[in-house]
């Protein structure tokens, strides 16, 4: 008799793929543009990335540091009207893209939560949650919660409102903290909260360090669903050198949880290459005409257009990973086991029941390495075969689909491999 199938876990929509943050509408759409109507025209692009949710804004009225002139129920006319927003929601729904609204109150000011009048602000947020849930949004984000006094209790209250409306609604909180204890204390009182933080932001040094950060986090959070990003808002290039971007894309898409990206992460958008552009929200490079300030600063291979035409580009890798992440059971909700593979490397297996399994091996170092995969670290349910098929490499030159002998696995500097192998009883 065939073994019984393992019961599938309940999956919410944000469990099924990546979230894509557009914090600055104007920067995302480029010079002279930047409104909700224009964003609607970019939904096909988001579909092509196979992201499941768009984290938008803030787009509400906010006069810098002025509580009275901050209205979370009103869209800033610079971004459009409520009708434009409704139209965007409808179009996104048709394309199966959920819309999460950022309600960080004082987003133009010094302190995101104002320095005083915490209760007034909290009440405004509560009213806004109810208003926008009725309007049809799929969730909310609030950032910089380290600046919010009694954050845990407010988050719990806001979570109740969100979940009370529907279990299918999501609340994301963002913090600049990278301290695991602070992160855990925020998570403790909020069961379904998705938290983005700077926890992984200093992980770029070595494979061992990254492995220990990831495993510590997963062990500490138990079987909670988590999210993976390097910060609550900023681009990957703020933290990583160009040669590690592919490696991190592979890692973020294959860890257990929801990967969260900022617009431009898919093309390696880098503010430092665009003089004068703000680090937190540089202009999106759709094509070579997107940055007319200094035309010579932009080459085709830095743009969406140029990378779309190149199967070896970062954007093409992002699309492939996003596709795999959204359709393979082992990546959707599979178990995770990290194991030793030698200094400088981070490797792990993702597996679910009798479905195809995945092996990820990441070389964070700047020298080529032979992987000494320590299968003895793994439980019997996640044993390694002698060979696995190469699904993709972050570097060009390998023959995809070819079987690789795991005992003789060699990785190039900064290379990541995604390998697949079947379940064996």
């Amino acid at each position: 008799r065939a073994p019984r199938c393992r019961e599938l876990p309940a999956q919410k929509w944000w469990h099924t793929g990546a979230l894509y943050r557009i914090g600055d509408l104007q920067a995302f759409q480029g010079h002279g543009a930047g409104n909700l109507a224009g964003l609607k025209g970019r939904l096909d692009y988001l579909s092509s990335l196979k992201v499941k949710g768009l984290v938008l804004g803030p787009i509400h009225k906010n006069q810098k540091d002025d509580v009275a002139q901050t209205d979370l129920l009103q869209i800033d006319p610079n971004f459009g009207s409520k009708e434009d927003f409704d139209s965007l929601l409808q179009s996104a729904k048709k394309k199966s893209i959920r819309v999460i609204l950022d309600l960080t109150p004082n987003y133009r000011g010094e302190n995101s939560w104002f320095s005083t009048q915490v209760d007034t602000v909290a009440t405004k947020v509560k009213d806004a949650l109810e208003f926008w849930l009725q309007a049809g949004v799929d969730g909310f984000q609030v950032r910089d919660i380290e600046n919010l006094k009694d954050a845990s209790s407010f988050l719990a209250e806001w979570q109740n409102i969100t979940k009370g409306f529907s279990e299918d609604r999501l609340l994301i909180a963002g913090t600049n903290s990278s301290d695991l204890q602070q992160i855990l204390s925020l998570l403790e009182s909020n069961k379904d909260l998705l938290l983005t933080s700077s926890y992984l932001s200093d992980s770029g040094s070595t494979g061992e360090h990254t492995k220990s950060l990831v495993t510590q986090y997963l062990n500490a959070t138990g079987n909670r669903w988590c999210s993976w990003s390097l910060s609550q808002a900023r681009l990957l290039t703020s933290f990583l050198p160009a040669q590690l971007l592919r490696l991190y894309q592979l890692m973020l898409f294959t860890l257990p949880g929801t990967p969260v990206f900022s617009y431009g992460d898919e093309i390696g958008l880098d503010a430092a290459a665009l003089p004068g552009q703000p680090m937190e929200a540089p202009v999106m490079l759709w094509d070579e005409s997107s940055f007319p300030d200094i035309p010579g600063a932009v080459s085709a291979n830095m743009t969406v257009k140029g990378q779309s035409e190149d199967p070896g580009s970062l954007l093409s890798l992002f699309r492939r990973l996003s596709d795999q992440r959204s359709k393979e059971r082992s990546l959707l909700h599979g178990d995770f086991h990290a194991f030793s593979a030698g200094p400088g490397l981070f490797s792990y297996i993702r597996h679910w029941d009798q479905n195809e399994r995945f092996l990820v091996v990441l070389n964070f170092g700047d020298v080529g390495l032979s992987a000494g995969l320590q299968a003895s670290d793994l439980p019997a349910s996640a044993s390694l075969p002698a060979k696995a098929d190469l699904l993709l490499s972050t570097q060009p030159g390998r023959e995809e689909g070819s079987p690789l002998e795991l005992e003789r696995l060699k990785l190039e500097p900064h290379e990541g491999l995604l390998l697949r192998f079947p379940y064996a009883a």
């Epitope: 002279g32 003089p275 004068g276 070579e288 007319p292 200094i294 035309p295």
Partner: antibody
Framework: QVQLVQSGAEVKKPGASVKVSCKAS????????MHWVRQAPGQGLEWMGI????????SYAQKFQGRVTMTRDTSTSTVYMELSSLRSEDTAVYYC??????????????????WGQGTMVTVSS | DIVMTQSPDSLAVSLGERATINCKSS????????????LAWYQQKPGQPPKLLIY???TRESGVPDRFSGSGSGTDFTLTISSLQAEDVAVYYC?????????FGQGTRLEIK
């Protein structure tokens, strides 16, 4: 009226650092990029870098990378340029210059419509 | 880096006569997406900071007398003063802003003959 007022002349020894200030008035400080350009005695103009006063992001000419730091203080509408490890070749007049902004398109091409009066920095042992 | 070369290095012209200064860039500064030339001209008088005269190769800055005009495209540009006045004695610089680092020509000294 729109103006940029720079700090006074400085005399420094080789190896030292100098910090020049540039106070803006007559316009919204955070809405325009600021640049630093220097001119050695009897020589041409040399662009050093840019600062966006809104977020503080900077970009420096390769030649000055690692030696120059541009900062700003929005509360006083002032930008600063600090040059370290000074050598005699750094003797020059240092200008802050406001980058142009195209009001219609919001683009900010890098040419300079307003200049400070200049700060003479002399490096000599 | 884009190298800007001006000619002549110095020029003497009689009052009321036409003065022409040339500027050549080592690569094109014409941007095809907006059909604009990323070139500016400045005037610098002794002891003063430079003053913007022309941008986009041919657009006169407000307040600049109409005897100043700019022309050219791609790599070759010209600043023309149609009728030289005494107050036009200065050093003139061209500047490209097509790419960083921003670069200037070496300057052309204009004097009265």
């Amino acid at each position: 009226q729109v103006q940029l007022v720079q700090s006074g002349a400085e005399v420094k020894k080789p190896g030292a650092s100098v910090k020049v200030s540039c106070k803006a008035s007559g316009y919204t400080f955070t809405s325009y990029y600021m640049h630093w350009v220097r001119q050695a005695p009897g020589q041409g103009l040399e662009w050093m870098g840019i600062i966006n006063p809104s977020g503080g992001s900077t970009s420096y000419a390769q030649k000055f990378q690692g030696r120059v730091t541009m900062t700003r203080d929005t509360s006083t509408s002032t930008v600063y340029m600090e040059l370290s490890s000074l050598r005699s070749e750094d003797t020059a007049v240092y200008y802050c210059a406001r980058g142009y902004e195209d009001i219609l398109t919001g683009s900010r091409p890098i040419f300079f419509d307003i200049w400070g009066q200049g700060t003479m920095v002399t490096v000599s042992s | 880096d884009i190298v800007m070369t001006q000619s002549p290095d110095s020029l003497a012209v009689s009052l009321g006569e036409r003065a022409t200064i040339n500027c050549k860039s080592s690569q094109s500064v014409l941007y095809s997406s907006n059909n604009k030339n990323y070139l500016a001209w400045y005037q610098q008088k002794p002891g003063q900071p430079p003053k913007l005269l022309i941008y986009w190769a041919s657009t006169r800055e407000s307040g600049v007398p109409d005897r100043f005009s700019g022309s050219g495209s791609g790599t070759d540009f010209t600043l023309t003063i149609s009728s030289l006045q005494a107050e036009d004695v200065a050093v003139y610089y061209c500047q490209q802003y097509y790419n960083t680092p921003i670069t200037f020509g070496q300057g052309t000294r204009l004097e009265i003959k």
